[in-house]
Interface confidence: medium
Amino acid sequence: HTAAQDNCTCPTNKMTVCSPDGPGGRCQCRALGSGMAVDCSTLTSKCLLLKARMSAPKNARTLVRPSEHALVDNDGLYDPDCDPEGRFKARQCNQTSVCWCVNSVGVRRTDKGDLSLRCDELVRTHHILIDLRHRPTAGAFNHSDLDAELRRLFRERYRLHPKFVAAVHYEQPTIQIELRQNTSQKAAGDVDIGDAAYYFERDIKGESLFQGRGGLDLRVRGEPLQVERTLIYYLDEIPPKFSMKRLT
């Protein structure tokens, strides 16, 4: 089943238009903005989700130190170009012909240029560090309980294979979730860590992309875990290329 048959909706992406016009009257769902058919049994790619979002009406340290090459998405929202598989095209341009290269999660990895800018390949983001700060609680969460709950969440809600959750670090009130997935490790059908991280980010912000599943309610041994700040760092298989001006 690609979508819920009876009422013809997409459980994993509410930013779709669905109708029973697939083969044999099957429910088929298309992403808003791009009109591309989506597989509703798994996560929709971040590129298609961003495109849909732009088309929608406007409304002693154990913690990991992000590497000098880590990217943070400071550019915010843009209307991306996606390839036929729903992945980000390596080069993105805006309406004023300003262009830049992005990684597989759609984050800019070069200085901005003009239409002559070349982006030879889509560079894979193989390591994502999700840095969360939780609201004050009566006491610290038990690290192993927190670890188990976050791993379970990524497996159940985002369908990310447990092997891609490399580590969960905790130093109250900071939680860090490390996702790692090399090109060679990602098999057909595996959820991409970039897509899982994006769904998680939207869930944390109270903007769930799931249909009919309620918002994210994160608990550790029944105790609500409320996030007050999120930072996501992206590490690419090939370091980004920025001018010295950008780095200072």
């Epitope: 089943h1 819920a4 048959q5 459980p11 049994s41 379970r152 969440l153 497996r155 159940e156 809600r157 369908r159 869930d203 799931f210 249909q211 009919g212 599943r213 309620g214 918002g215 994210l216 309610d217 994160l218 608990r219 029944g222 609500p224």
Partner: antibody, heavy 121, light 107 residues
Framework: QIQLVQSGHEVKKPGASVKVSCKAS????????MNWVRQAPGQGLEWMGW????????TYAEEFKGRFVFSLETSASTAYLQISSLKAEDMAMYFC??????????????WGQGTTVTVSS | DIQMTQSPSSLSASVGDRVTITCKAS??????VAWYQQKPGKAPKVLIY???YRYTGVPDRFSGSGSGTDFTFTISSLQPEDIAVYYC?????????FGGGTKVEIK
């Protein structure tokens, strides 16, 4: 300890109304959603829907839209199920069950003891 | 709605036997399946959630596995107190749905 205590068994005539209560104790009432589940005699379990204890917003399964109403008395940590225009097929055991707001917690870890509603003329 | 097809509907086994119940979802529900035990005249009790996570205080003879559409619940060594009806439930998407139940009896 954490528990849900439901009101006593009810015997009603067809066309009448009934209101079943579910009183929570031992936890923060508004931290968890409250679900209602029906079990007809000798039958399985049917999810009727749930009520968001933070906002009071009810969600009903398709089959339970219309004559069934979920409500709250938050100050008393109590959820209610009201059934109007009772029919013979409403005769069942009704359970309340504690669940969460997100998909990860849509299973029920605490249940009321059940309230039997008998419809007989 | 997602249909949960549970089998068998009843079974009879001896004390100490390994008992297996299966549940098939009509569409992919990730690992969002719970298993409950219900004794006559009582409310159900959750044993397993998220396919394989044992709920607090549940004996380790109860286990669960599976993902996608196929799920299994196992009692590794049946005890007299395990006589009950067992239900699976998908907790992936609303409306939440239960399997038809499996009645477990002692031979």
């Amino acid at each position: 300890q954490i528990q849900l205590v439901q009101s006593g068994h009810e015997v009603k005539k067809p066309g009448a109304s009934v209101k079943v209560s579910c009183k929570a104790s031992g936890y923060t009432f508004t931290n968890y959603g409250m679900n209602w589940v029906r079990q007809a005699p000798g039958q399985g379990l049917e999810w009727m829907g749930w009520i968001n204890t933070k906002t009071g917003e009810p969600t009903y399964a398709e089959e339970f839209k219309g004559r069934f109403v979920f409500s709250l008395e938050t100050s008393a940590s109590t959820a209610y199920l009201q059934i109007s225009s009772l029919k013979a097929e409403d005769m069942a055991m009704y359970f309340c069950g504690r669940g969460g707001y997100g998909s990860s917690y849509w299973y029920f870890d605490v249940w009321g003891q059940g309230t039997t509603v008998t419809v007989s003329s | 709605d997602i249909q949960m097809t549970q089998s068998p509907s009843s079974l009879s086994a001896s004390v100490g036997d390994r008992v297996t119940i299966t549940c098939k979802a009509s569409q992919d529900v990730s690992i969002a399946v719970a298993w409950y035990q219900q004794k006559p005249g009582k409310a159900p009790k959750v044993l397993i959630y998220s396919a394989s996570y044992r709920y607090t205080g549940v004996p380790d003879r109860f286990s669960g596995s599976g993902s996608g559409t196929d799920f299994t619940f196992t009692i590794s060594s049946l005890q007299p107190e395990d006589i009950a009806v067992y239900y699976c439930q998908q907790h992936y998407i609303t409306p939440l749905t239960f399997g038809g139940g499996t009645k477990v009896e002692i031979k």
